[in-house]
């Protein structure tokens, strides 16, 4: 395969009705989540920031490819939505649900 | 390949001579690292430490395996150390380094 | 001392199937990751594939020659490394070595004396 | 072909010293992987002789040093015995297609 492009944040659109949600979620019908993708490969410069944790791990890595993995691109700030939605009782809640949306990614 | 295991802390202890960094670093010599690895798979249980958006994610990869990857284990928790050590001045510092322990792991 | 010594090569027909072992000793199997690596007579060595260890879930890749006809895998109690190859072609005769890969710095620190493995009709 | 380039064949007599060359790409050695160098006897298996560039496992004489430079390394035999003909490969790991990649293989002759 190819090289993987280094860890960057990638464009994700969840559409409620894909995940079958679309019967207990009211609005919104979908939200741009977004997602993390990407090599964490040495050299790790600033774009990709990195934990001090992950730069002595691709060190560790290169020398020791065998049992010790890459540190892996994730999401380093993350967004709230607000959903609208039925409880269990049928009564509509407006609720803010944490880490829904990321906005910036780095490797771990 | 086979299942891989779900993703968890596993030790590792780092000596700094491996990282050639042994003329610098006056002490100490090494320190319990620590890495992330394992697999982010449906369904993501309480011990994963999942963020909301990782459950989201690891729904659309289920559906879309080819353009959306699973989430990755990555450090959850992270600490510090103090490391003595050589400036470029040849002067004797004593630094608190963020970041650099692997304490525990979810996906993200 | 560590040892490691293959087993399980013969002549085998074009399609057919061969199981190799590697039998570990000398030291904790469980702890090491583990490679099968070939020479074809005459020729370099090429790398087969590896299997991980219990606490990565015994994940194991292969070159892509060999994928999807060839298996690793292993059992840790018995202290043995198996090749599981099916479909069998030619070009698979090798001499097939298993190595262990030491643990700081990835390299083959031990290898088996090889077994052979004849693939002709 | 051999992901690592290595020259098919290389001489020295007693006593000279060789290197034998290692040329990979931007994702094995020039990603920063380590380098390790291996001697086969002929009708031996290989035997570990360099291993993360340029240290050497218990046993095995100071004649024999590696090192590496950017999508480069080598390895060099001083002070060349007729116990030494043999053939060199070299390996490394590589991120962007099979894991574990070797060299083609050096033969070395020590001559008279």
């Known amino acids: 395969s190819e090289l993987k492009t280094a860890c960057k944040k990638h464009e994700l659109y969840v559409s409620f009705q894909d995940l079958g949600w679309q019967d207990w979620i009211i609005a919104p019908k979908g939200y741009a989540a977004n997602y993390c993708d990407g090599e964490c490969s040495f050299p790790l410069n600033a774009h990709m920031n990195a934990t001090n944790h992950a730069i002595v791990q691709t060190l560790v890595h290169l020398m020791n490819p065998e049992y010790v993995p890459k540190p892996c691109c994730a999401p380093t700030k993350l967004n709230a939505i607000s959903v609208l939605y039925f409880d269990d009782n049928s009564n509509v809640i407006l609720k803010k649900y944490r880490n829904m949306v990321v906005r910036a990614c780095g490797c771990h | 390949s086979e299942l891989k295991t779900a993703c968890k802390k596993h030790e590792l202890y780092v000596s700094f001579q491996d990282l050639g960094w042994q003329d610098w670093i006056i002490a100490p010599k090494g320190y319990a690292a620590n890495y992330c690895d394992g697999e982010c798979s449906f369904p993501l249980n309480a011990h994963m430490n999942a963020t909301n958006h990782a459950i989201v994610q690891t729904l659309v990869h289920l559906m879309n395996p080819e353009y959306v990857p699973k989430p990755c284990c990555a450090p959850t928790k992270l600490n510090a150390i103090s490391v003595l050590y050589f400036d470029d001045n040849s002067n004797v510092i004593l630094k608190k380094y963020r970041n650099m322990v692997v304490r525990a792991c979810g996906c993200h | 001392q560590v040892q490691l010594v293959e087993s399980g090569g013969g002549l085998v027909k074009p399609g057919g199937s061969l199981r190799l072992s590697c039998a570990a000793s000398?030291?904790?199997?469980?702890?090491?990751?583990v490679h099968w690596v070939r020479q074809a007579p005459g020729k370099g060595l090429e790398w087969v594939g590896r299997i991980r260890l219990e606490t990565h879930g015994y994940a194991a890749e292969y070159a892509a020659s060999v994928k999807g006809r060839f298996t690793i895998s292993r059992d840790d109690s018995k202290n043995t490394l198996y090749l599981q190859m099916n479909s069998l072609k030619t070009e698979d005769t090798a001499v097939y070595y298993c190595?262990?890969?030491?643990?700081?710095?990835?390299?083959?620190?031990?290898w088996g004396q090889g077994t052979l493995v004849t693939v002709s009709s | 072909q051999s992901v690592l380039t290595q020259p098919p064949s290389v001489s020295g007599a007693p006593g000279q010293r060789v290197t034998i060359s290692c040329t990979g790409s931007?994702?094995?050695?020039?990603?920063?992987?380590?380098v390790h160098w291996y001697q086969q006897l002929p009708g031996t298996a290989p035997k570990l002789l360099i291993y993360?560039?340029?240290e050497r496992p218990s046993g095995v004489p100071d004649r024999f040093s590696g090192s590496k430079s950017g999508t480069s390394a080598s390895l060099a035999i001083t002070g060349l015995q007729a116990e030494d003909e043999a053939d060199y490969y070299c390996q490394s790991w590589d991120s962007s297609q099979t894991l574990v990649v070797f060299g083609g293989g050096t033969k070395l002759t020590v001559l008279g």
């Open positions: 993360g560039q340029s």
């Open positions: 931007s994702s094995n050695i020039g990603a920063g992987y380590s």
């Open positions: 000398g030291f904790t199997f469980s702890s090491y990751v």
């Open positions: 190595a262990r890969v030491e643990r700081s710095k990835s390299g083959f620190d031990n």
